[in-house]
């Protein structure tokens, strides 16, 4: 049998007992479960309001999910001696609404960070780079998971949410080694123009379940290592020649385009031609038209140029109201 990917650990855990004694380096914090054998600490669904100070030095995998952290300040995980082994940090669903600059400083081995399902009204531009230098020390992050971090409308800052996230991703060019970036379910209307150029090592990019209408101003040209591009469940109407050429030019990419409201008019002709000959689109036989009404549910691969027409635009003198 095959298995979908997962990252759960089945090692035994020791429930922590609260202690009046000063914490030992390898003691388990109150309200957490620890397994030294699995190098894992789980402080899950405990309504914690701050990161435990007494995390054991052996911790490699830290789960702080389902809490009430609210704010992650600078140096939230800085310890003496540092948590030098910490490689995977999961903070999903912990009611974070603010992640400040330098929140993840002094974690030299941090490879995977999951901030999903937190309504981030404020994400500092220096959350991942740790400093406001134009070129920062490279972050060790390889996987950054930011699904559903969009705050409710009434909690949004004045600037665009897309811009706020983009600023954090490009600051100091710190994330040049990032291989995986998940940005699904964030109501993105657009992808800021220069973000991908600053993430040249990306292999996996998930932008699914957003509200992207167009990729016209997005350049994938730099992403020569990209293996998976997920664009399912957006608001894409057509992919134009420039985008098609860039995607075709990426040597290893697989593109996922399911569940977009494709508009099958004369502007779709180039994309249909490309779909028929490309090997990069996964499940391309499932792509169907959403508009115009007469084309609804037609399979894109089965269309020919005669099917793809645009209603002529009448000169103003002949238009009727």
């Amino acid at each position: 049998t095959s298995s979908a990917s997962s990252s759960s650990s089945s090692a035994p855990f020791l429930a922590s007992a609260a202690s009046a004694q000063p914490p030992l380096p390898d003691q388990c914090p109150a309200l957490c479960e620890c397994s030294e054998a699995a190098r894992t600490v789980k402080c899950v669904n405990r309504n914690l309001t701050e990161v435990p100070t007494d995390l054991p030095l052996y911790v490699r995998n830290l789960f702080l999910t389902g809490n009430q952290l609210a704010v992650l300040p600078a140096g939230a995980f800085a310890r003496r001696p540092p948590l030098a082994e910490l490689a995977a940090l999961n903070l999903s669903g912990s009611r974070l609404d603010e992640v400040r600059g330098g929140a993840f400083e002094h974690l030299p081995s941090l490879r995977q960070l999951d901030l999903s399902h937190n309504p981030l009204a404020y994400l500092s531009p220096f959350a991942f780079s740790g400093s406001n230098a134009s070129i920062s020390a490279p972050s060790p992050l390889v996987e950054l998971i930011l699904n559903h971090i969009v705050p409710p409308d009434d909690k949004r800052q004045n600037r665009s949410f897309e811009g706020m996230v983009a600023a954090a991703l490009v600051a100091g060019r710190a994330l040049q080694g990032l291989h995986l970036l998940e940005l699904a379910s964030n109501h993105f209307l657009y992808l800021p123009r220069d973000v991908l150029a600053q993430l040249p090592s990306l292999r996996y990019l998930d932008l699914s379940n957003n509200s992207l209408v167009s990729l016209t101003y997005v350049s994938f040209r730099n992403l020569t290592h990209l293996e998976s591009l997920h664009l399912e469940d957006n608001a894409l109407k057509v992919l134009h020649n420039g985008t098609l050429a860039e995607l075709q030019g990426l040597p290893h990419v697989r593109v996922f385009l399911d569940n977009n409201p494709w508009v099958c008019d004369c502007h779709m002709a180039d994309m249909v031609t490309w779909l028929k000959q490309t090997g990069v689109v996964q499940g391309k036989d499932r792509l169907t038209c959403a508009f115009p009404e007469k084309m609804r549910n037609r399979v894109l691969l089965e269309l020919n140029s005669a099917d793809l027409d645009c209603d002529p635009i009448l000169p103003p003198s002949l238009q009727t109201s």
């Epitope: 095959s2 298995s3 979908a4 990917s5 997962s6 998971i145 699904n147 998940e182 699904a184 996996y204 998930d206 699914s208 998976s228 997920h230 399912e232 697989r254 996922f256 399911d258 090997g279 990069v280 996964q282 499940g283 391309k284 036989d285 499932r286």
Partner: nanobody, 120 residues
């Protein structure tokens, strides 16, 4: 239910050959690119080779170029990896992979793996 079942692994001497197979079911095999990955003891899983839907395009890790060949038979729903001139450093568990959708939705499928040991 998506299933990927690898076979063909075993013990082989340096310089020898093996052919791995991956039988796929539960999805439209011909509509998806497929990959082989491997994981050696104490190392991270790495991409070995991948092939597009109709087999028109293939890619290989630098370490196996010229020695390994990936292919597919869409009529048989089977993915292959022909491994020639095997070296000790090719020793690993080899996995077949089908990515049918976002990883976060559990749509990145893996077989159970087949062990390849290259040793004299």
């Amino acid at each position: 239910e998506v299933q990927l079942v690898e076979s063909g692994g075993g013990l082989v001497q340096p310089g020898g050959s093996l052919r791995l197979s991956c039988a796929a079911s539960g999805f439209t095999f011909s509509s998806y690119a497929m990959s082989w990955y491997r994981q050696a003891p104490g190392k991270e899983r790495e991409l070995v080779a991948s092939i597009t839907t109709a087999g028109g395009s293939t890619r290989y890790a630098d370490s196996v170029k010229g020695r390994f060949t990936i292919s597919r038979d869409n009529a048989k729903n089977t993915l292959y990896l022909q491994m020639n001139s095997l070296r000790a450093e090719d020793t690993a568990v080899y996995y077949c992979n089908a990515e049918l959708g976002p990883r976060r939705l559990g749509m990145d499928y893996w077989g159970q793996g087949t062990l390849v040991t290259v040793s004299s």
